[in-house]
Amino acid sequence: MAPWPELGDAQPNPDKYLEGAAGQQPTAPDKSKETNKTDNTEAPVTKIELLPSYSTATLIDEPTEVDDPWNLPTLQDSGIKWSERDTKGKILCFFQGIGRLILLLGFLYFFVCSLDILSSAFQLVGGKMAGQFFSNSSIMSNPLLGLVIGVLVTVLVQSSSTSTSIVVSMVSSSLLTVRAAIPIIMGANIGTSITNTIVALMQVGDRSEFRRAFAGATVHDFFNWLSVLVLLPVEVATHYLEIITQLIVESFHFKNGEDAPDLLKVITKPFTKLIVQLDKKVISQIAMNDEKAKNKSLVKIWCKTFTNKTQINVTVPSTANCTSPSLCWTDGIQNWTMKNVTYKENIAKCQHIFVNFHLPDLAVGTILLILSLLVLCGCLIMIVKILGSVLKGQVATVIKKTINTDFPFPFAWLTGYLAILVGAGMTFIVQSSSVFTSALTPLIGIGVITIERAYPLTLGSNIGTTTTAILAALASPGNALRSSLQIALCHFFFNISGILLWYPIPFTRLPIRMAKGLGNISAKYRWFAVFYLIIFFFLIPLTVFGLSLAGWRVLVGVGVPVVFIIILVLCLRLLQSRCPRVLPKKLQNWNFLPLWMRSLKPWDAVVSKFTGCFQMRCCCCCRVCCRACCLLCDCPKCCRCSKCCEDLEEAQEGQDVPVKAPETFDNITISREAQGEVPASDSKTECTAL
């Protein structure tokens, strides 16, 4: 497969348009190299239709005039201005604003809780398997295997802190060296970025929103993957992370600190612990080859236990099995010895839904996975809707300017670094990079934050999660302090190295360009987002894992040709875009390859065949639910079915017409009506003041 889904001519062509969300779009300068192009064979067709006589706005736009899809949308304010309202209107508007704020905080709370439960669900479904990944002895000698184990385990348990704590306990008990642990930590860093990518998938309903959200989420993935791509070979060759962190750990006489403050958990834990509570020690025990742990359930049953350490007399086959010669005796028939036993007495059961069901972990995990994804999706939809209604006009302008504007010259370059600090600080407060980046995703989607601004915030989040780990390490007991601190520092310096690689010089901000490219592809072929997720977080790691188990020879035998092909394609791509003249005519574009190797169109047809039937059913269901909801809330005009259905109808009608952005309309109310956003009759009741 070629590296980009649509590969036409390499030369810039003003007549070619991007395959974007709203049909044909013009190529933006520079960005065209990153985005997908149409094939030579398919020329864009612009349809011009006559408009209804009442409209003075031109709905059909000339292809050349359409804005860059990455420009933030202007969230229009159709409401009455504050100054024009009477007292009653102002009071009503104030209370509406307060109500929206409460709702927003409520949905945000359940959004974070559902992320926590999603993590628990993943641990129940794949936690034991994740633990078994760690018990593989090849980790010690194969850094690539360590890396993919880090990715797989973190993806399976949906928590980098769980996977790193397993690594720490393994290093503390000498089952793993720090050197072998570093690739695992790098993998954990990659694995943790899946959460916000899943969250971005929830915004699949609106193409342009999804484009931004998915790109905003995957900028994290690309940063991590690219950092590993460069830093893992550097670490294997030089062991710089191991050496630096060892020097730091040895030069400081650290005293055991206090636990990192649990700020967000304090609020979410009372709710999440009513849903499910897990005994996370089980995964660590499996990782450390504890046979008994394999049969233990991850679902915590007893929350209050009394542990009593006693010495009991036990019979042994012979005196050779005695604890020590002095603790050995006979009763004349059997040999006895004294054994230290920890007697655990169960006092009180946990108070959560699954405590008395005695279901297998897989069943509980599956139930929670479905429920948490539904809640996550629901909360996300509501957050986006509320933010959409709040962030209009003046409010939106202020927020967008505050977040996305740079400092005045000559300090503009500092803005990004401040964003990194903000990201680190926010992550430290919420104690989870997944929560922070997942909360950021819908904001990128609705256009409050640009990807360029989200990037440093995400990098800061990566730093924030490592500072939390350092604090947690300082709170470790004596025997684990050194190893946990060194691993936390490795994680910290790995992220710092990554930032130094992919942030300071604008040219090196490859993750942004790659994420935008993927955003464009995923906006057109939305199934590709799921495909990307499966490939990058499951198939590639699992393939490397399988090949590594087969041995170095097999891994090199398969890996080297694959890497060679990738490098060859990348070089060819670079030459095609930079200096195509040096290439033979045939290689100046990808047309020499069959269509399925250079375009996603044939694949799209296959996927569409499979999903078409399901999509139709889904839309029918959606309409029924939607209408029922409208009847209940007594507003027959309020119902707009999901975007997926509209797109489906569009596809069936064969309308591939670029529509003007709302801000180009003369009559705002008409424009919003035309787009189906607001019923004309209800437009005057919109309240935007918060």
Epitope: N313, P325, S326, C328, W329, T330, D331, G332, Q334, W336
Partner: antibody, heavy 119, light 107 residues
Framework: QVQLVQSGAEVKKPGASVKVSCKAS????????MHWVRQAPGQGLEWMGA????????AYNQKFKGRVTMTRDTSTSTVYMELSSLRSEDTAVYYC????????????WGQGTLVTVSS | DIQLTQSPSFLSASVGDRVTITCKAS??????VAWYQQKPGKAPKLLIY???TRHSGVPSRFSGSGSGTEFTLTISSLQPEDFATYYC?????????FGQGTKLEIK
């Protein structure tokens, strides 16, 4: 209270066998080992072996192996010790003693049975 | 087999005296040692087990100490009924063995 009542004195000829009984009462018979210890006239104590009435498991002192057999009858809470191929040096007082659970100290002893071996 | 050697074999003492009897094992027996008292014509009676633990009903004047290979039985204040033969026994390994005994007589 715990009581161990042994059978009466026996006089045996060399080469013969002797079977001494020990009836236990006052405790759960099957939980404690029953040891047999002998004491030759004017000599010290010598452990012969033990039986666990619960399962019938036995352990003998190598010195007596092949000559001594310990059995039990749980219905009557009685333990038997049979010593075959008697010799004159087997003349001694034979004691049964109940062993404390889990270790080899003997907390309660029978009154003893004098076995005299003479031609 | 583990040998136990008691010393002295004979001991003369008066009522009220403090008496110490020692027992040496040929190898480490931990604390798996018991002490018995036997009066003429009677069965032995358990005094101490686990080297230091007094059996129920045994007067407090009897005490045991030691671990490994050296053990002692101490009678803090001799009473008339204490004149008897004392045996140490190990139950560290089979066969169980007894010391040769220490005869305590009235001076």
């Amino acid at each position: 209270q715990v009581q161990l009542v042994q059978s009466g004195a026996e006089v045996k000829k060399p080469g013969a066998s002797v079977k001494v009984s020990c009836k236990a009462s006052g405790y759960t018979f099957t939980t404690n080992n029953m040891h047999w210890v002998r004491q030759a006239p004017g000599q010290g104590l010598e452990w012969m072996g033990a039986i666990y009435p619960g399962s019938g498991a036995t352990a003998y002192n190598q010195k007596f192996k092949g000559r001594v057999t310990m059995t039990r009858d749980t219905s009557t809470s009685t333990v038997y010790m049979e010593l075959s191929s008697l010799r004159s040096e087997d003349t001694a007082v034979y004691y049964c003693a109940s062993g404390m659970y889990g270790h080899g100290a003997m907390d309660y002893w029978g009154q003893g049975t004098l076995v005299t071996v003479s031609s | 087999d583990i040998q136990l050697t008691q010393s002295p074999s004979f001991l003369s003492a008066s009522v009220g005296d403090r008496v110490t009897i020692t027992c040496k094992a040929s190898q480490d027996v931990g604390t798996a040692v018991a002490w018995y008292q036997q009066k003429p014509g009677k069965a032995p009676k358990l005094l101490i087990y686990w080297a230091t633990t007094r059996h129920s009903g045994v007067p407090s004047r009897f005490s045991g100490s030691g671990s490994g290979t050296e053990f002692t039985l101490t009678i803090s204040s001799l009473q008339p009924e204490d004149f008897a033969t004392y045996y140490c026994q190990q139950y560290s390994s089979n066969p169980l063995t007894f010391g040769q005994g220490t005869k305590l007589e009235i001076k």
